[in-house]
């Protein structure tokens, strides 16, 4: 008996071939011997089966001795043995219809779980293997679960269902809702304008939700809400904003915030959360601000940084085009009685300069 695998919702074509290459009488029946369809001369006739409105054939092939049964919009319960009667012969085809669906929405927040459920006909024992967009393979039976979805899991999942040495392939598009970056650091000299951007890693036609940026300044004992906003059809509207700093927020995506100037009291780290409509949980992005200040007070030239710096970062003071006078893995360095000239304060990571501030020391007479 020939086995054909079908996909729920798809169309399947079961073949039936006569030895004579001409139009002759044929009938398709199900395992209960109920007529599905057949012909009367050149006319298609239908029986009282449940498939009535979804069954068809290809009249153009009848003259060649081919009498296919086409079943549209397949359902799991269409799984059955179909019998084609032609020329006193009976051709049997076993149709097995499978469905594969994501348990909830196909738009999931980063860190959430994805469960794929296989619908299969009674008596079948299929195996399923799915390949994620990043090439990860998972295997299972009726259900497959992936916990802690990552950004790279966004895209088309390809799942193969295997039954009786036959296979059918499903493609499911999964969108992982997340920010493009989990964390970012902005390095600024004191007084410079600061821009924070929070690009999303997905696009949807209508995006609605609400968000908030909490800020923990290095100098402050507790965190504070800097801004709250709503998102309606991709339009950002600010609901409440702190008066210090004087923040501005862009009205269109990507989410974007600006501070008029970087000051030591703003250095620290923030957490932007975005709650999307009809989704449980929130998207998060951490943002850090490091501020540098170079000052000369009497005979002391000082360079300081505030904010979350890694212990391996190097802070240096050097006279232009000369070797560093002082270099330390600390957040403040100074030079007593500095020579006249243009001094540079550098914050660097393995030789790469992250932040630079210049200060001119005038000669003392």
């Amino acid at each position: 008996k020939k086995v054909v695998l079908g996909k729920k919702g798809d169309t399947v074509e079961l073949t039936c071939t006569a030895s004579q290459k001409k139009s002759i009488q044929f009938h398709w029946k199900n395992s209960n011997q109920i007529k599905i369809l057949g012909n009367q001369g050149s006319f298609l006739t239908k029986g009282p089966s449940k498939l009535n409105d979804r069954a068809d054939s290809r009249r153009s092939l009848w003259d060649q001795g081919n009498f296919p049964l086409i079943i549209k919009n397949l359902k799991i319960e269409d799984s059955d043995t179909y019998i084609c009667e032609v020329e006193d012969q009976k051709e049997e085809v076993q149709l097995l219809v499978f469905g594969l669906t994501a348990n909830s929405d196909t738009h999931l927040l980063q860190g959430q779980s994805l469960t794929l459920t296989l619908e299969s006909p009674p008596g079948s024992s299929p195996s399923v293997q799915c390949r994620s967009p990043r090439g990860k393979n998972i295997q299972g039976g009726k259900t497959l679960s992936v916990s802690q979805l990552e950004l790279q899991d966004s895209g088309t999942w390809t799942c193969t269902v295997l039954q009786n040495q036959k296979k059918v392939e499903f493609k499911i598009d999964i969108v992982v809702l997340a920010f493009q970056k989990a964390s970012s650091i902005v390095y600024k000299k004191e007084g410079e304008q600061v821009e924070f951007s929070f690009p999303l890693a997905f696009t949807v036609e209508k995006l609605t939700g609400s968000g908030e940026l909490w800020w923990q300044a290095e100098r402050a004992s507790s965190s504070k809400s800097w801004i709250t906003f709503d998102l309606k059809n991709k339009e950002v509207s600010v609901k409440r904003v702190t008066q210090d700093p004087k923040l501005q927020m862009g009205k269109k995506l990507p989410l974007h915030l600006t501070l008029p100037q970087a000051l030591p009291q703003y250095a620290g780290s923030g957490n932007l959360t975005l709650a999307l409509e009809a989704k449980t949980g929130k998207l998060h992005q951490e943002v850090n601000l490091v501020v540098m200040r170079a000052t000369q007070l009497q005979k002391n030239l000082t360079c300081e940084v505030w904010g979350p710096t890694s212990p391996k970062l190097m802070l240096s003071l050097k006279l232009e085009n000369k070797e560093a006078k002082v270099s330390k893995r600390e957040k403040a360095v100074w030079v007593l009685n500095p020579e006249a000239g243009m001094w540079q304060c550098l914050l660097s990571d393995s030789g790469q300069v992250l932040l630079e501030s210049n200060i001119k020391v005038l000669p003392t007479w």
Epitope: V194, S237, Q248, K252
Partner: antibody, heavy 119, light 107 residues
Framework: EVELLESGGGLVQPGGSLRLSCAAS????????MSWVRQAPGKGLEWVSG????????YYADSVKGRFTITSDNSKNTLYLQMNSLRAEDTAVYYC????????????WGKGTTVTVSS | AIQMTQSPSSLSASVGDRVTITCRAS??????LGWYQQKPGKAPKVLIS???SLQSGVPSRFSGSRSGTDFTLTISSLQPEDFATYYC?????????FGQGTKLEIK
């Protein structure tokens, strides 16, 4: 072709009220954000008020906050600006403008309607 | 509100000249800035959106650029029909703000 036509301007005494209308043709009104922009005689352009396509969010310049109200009627494809407690400095040509999809810029402007506040 | 400082307020130039007009934003506004041309008695017309996107039908002699919070409109070779008043507009956030305008006159 998209067209905007303002009406409702005229002469009004200080402290009085006026309602400006902007009838739009050739567009699905609820899709686009709209704005009112004014220009006092011999002066530059001043953005006055804006409304999101859905009509849910409204915005105002500080100079008119609390006195002006922007609304829209999607069924009539019409934008309104209710102006109360009018002052001499509100004298201007008032333009309505449609914003591009995704709020890129004000791509279509009306010809303007003149409001004169004088005793 | 974000302030837009436009300069110069007026400018005399000749046909064929290269002209630049600048706008400085008091806050970072990404590329959310447009340039508008207005002729006497007429409504403004958009020339450039999002800092540098030339609108359809606008001659290629008009161009826009940005450096930080400084935005520039350049007309590479002035034509007689370019004598008008030019405004920048930040549409980064509400309330929107225009620059004070630059009146471009024939020398």
């Amino acid at each position: 072709e998209v067209e905007l036509l303002e009406s409702g301007g005229g002469l009004v005494q200080p402290g009085g009220s006026l309602r400006l209308s902007c009838a739009a043709s050739g567009l699905t009104f609820s899709t686009f954000a709209m704005s009112w922009v004014r220009q006092a005689p011999g002066k530059g352009l001043e953005w006055v008020s804006g409304i999101s396509g859905s009509g849910e969010n409204t915005y105002y310049a500080d100079s008119v906050k609390g006195r002006f109200t922007i609304t829209s009627d999607n069924s009539k494809n019409t934008l309104y600006l209710q102006m109360n407690s009018l002052r001499a400095e509100d004298t201007a040509v008032y333009y309505c403008a449609k914003e591009g999809y995704n709020w890129n810029y004000m791509d279509v402007w009306g010809k303007g309607t003149t409001v004169t506040v004088s005793s | 509100a974000i302030q837009m400082t436009q300069s110069p307020s007026s400018l005399s130039a000749s046909v064929g000249d290269r002209v630049t007009i600048t706008c400085r934003a008091s806050h970072g506004i990404r590329n959310d800035l447009g340039w508008y041309q207005q002729k006497p008695g007429k409504a403004p017309k958009v020339l450039i959106s999002e800092t540098s996107s030339l609108q359809s039908g606008v001659p290629s002699r008009f161009s826009g650029s940005r450096s930080g919070t400084d935005f520039t409109l350049t007309i590479s070779s002035l034509q007689p029909e370019d004598f008008a008043t030019y405004y920048c507009l930040q549409d980064y956030t509400y309330p929107y703000t225009f620059g004070q305008g630059t009146k471009l006159e024939i020398k």
